[in-house]
Amino acid sequence: APVRSLNCTLRDSQQKSLVMSGPYELKALHLQGQDMEQQVVFSMSFVQGEESNDKIPVALGLKEKNLYLSCVLKDDKPTLQLESVDPKNYPKKKMEKRFVFNKIEINNKLEFESAQFPNWYISTSQAENMPVFLGGTKGGQDITDFTMQFVSS
């Protein structure tokens, strides 16, 4: 059976939107009006992995692009990147672990924990116009809480 996917946008808890920053990076900034069109639309795929009531494994692809968020070690540090894939083979139910995030719902907010690196989360900064990254702390300065907005196909 084909993998189930939905289209969505994400905003951090400061209401910053996510946009492309160069070919292989995302950044977070406040957008208004027509500029909202700049925000990236994700194709969130529901994939194989450890699942519970509040924890669902997903892959985050960029809609109509062969790019997926992935978590890899760079200089011995868990790092978030946009990785190019062969569109003929993706998305798939059994995604490689580096592409998998545990979508965790807490108090109507979402966290995205790396399956590859437990306790590392998709994060943004308080500052405007700075990259989205993989952070190893919750509840500190870095923002790990998001809301999801559904986008019609």
Partner: antibody, heavy 118, light 107 residues
């Protein structure tokens, strides 16, 4: 008053290492992104590296990637740049700068000169 | 990487002149552009951020305009202390990049 004071520069042989420090005062250091920017003698400005307030997010210019490491100690209000495998083309004045709105450098230190020569 | 091209690379002007410096980005950077002034032996000083916003404490004779790929820094009525080198810098994406600089000399 915001102050940034770099130290640690000097003469080093090619292949050698150096660690630069930047002592910050007059603002809440732990809340700001920080940059290192360099300027070769008689040349323009070149961005080197950035670090987020928590230290989890770092980025580097291609020219220093794999050789330089940016870090910070928020308890000491200090920014660092560890420079390994130094080359003649790394000779420059190195500035630390506080990152302002959207990615500009709103305050700069006075710079420290690094000379790589045999 | 985004390339930033400044023109002219140097210019001779007189006190009281109106001066315009141009900065072009190799791709759209929205309004994520800053302008700096540097005098010999000193660190750069931020003049303008977000293409048009004057940094606190900077005289109002400095102004910035533009968005997308084409930007200008204008100095109305040059003062003796304005003879310096000016740099633009894009902050749209990493690696951040600077223009090559414009040296403003006394005619």
């Amino acid at each position: 008053e915001v102050q940034l004071l770099e130290s640690g520069g000097g003469l080093v042989q090619p292949g050698g290492s150096l660690r630069l420090s930047c002592a910050a005062s007059g603002f809440t250091f732990s809340k700001y992104f920080m940059f290192w920017v360099r300027q070769a003698p008689g040349k323009g400005l070149e961005w080197v590296s950035v670090i987020s307030p928590s230290g989890h997010m770092t980025r580097y210019a291609d020219s220093v990637k794999g050789r330089f490491t940016i870090s910070r100690d928020n308890s000491k209000n200090t920014l660092y740049l560890q420079m390994n495998s130094l080359r003649a083309e790394d000779t420059a004045v190195y500035y630390c700068a506080r990152v302002g709105y959207g990615g500009n450098s709103d305050y700069w230190g006075q710079g420290t000169l690094v000379t790589v020569s045999s | 990487d985004i390339q930033m091209t400044q023109s002219p690379s140097s210019v001779s002007a007189s006190v009281g002149d109106r001066l315009t410096i141009i900065c072009r980005a190799s791709q759209d950077i929205n309004r994520w552009l800053a302008w700096y002034q540097q005098t010999p032996g000193n660190a750069p000083k931020l003049l303008i951020h977000s293409a048009t916003s004057l940094q606190s404490g900077v005289p109002s004779r400095f102004s910035g305009s533009g968005s997308g790929t084409d930007f200008t820094l204008t100095i109305n009525s040059l003062q003796p202390e304005d003879f310096a080198t000016y740099y633009c810098q894009q902050a749209d994406s990493f690696p951040l990049t600077f223009g090559g600089g414009t040296k403003v000399e006394i005619k």
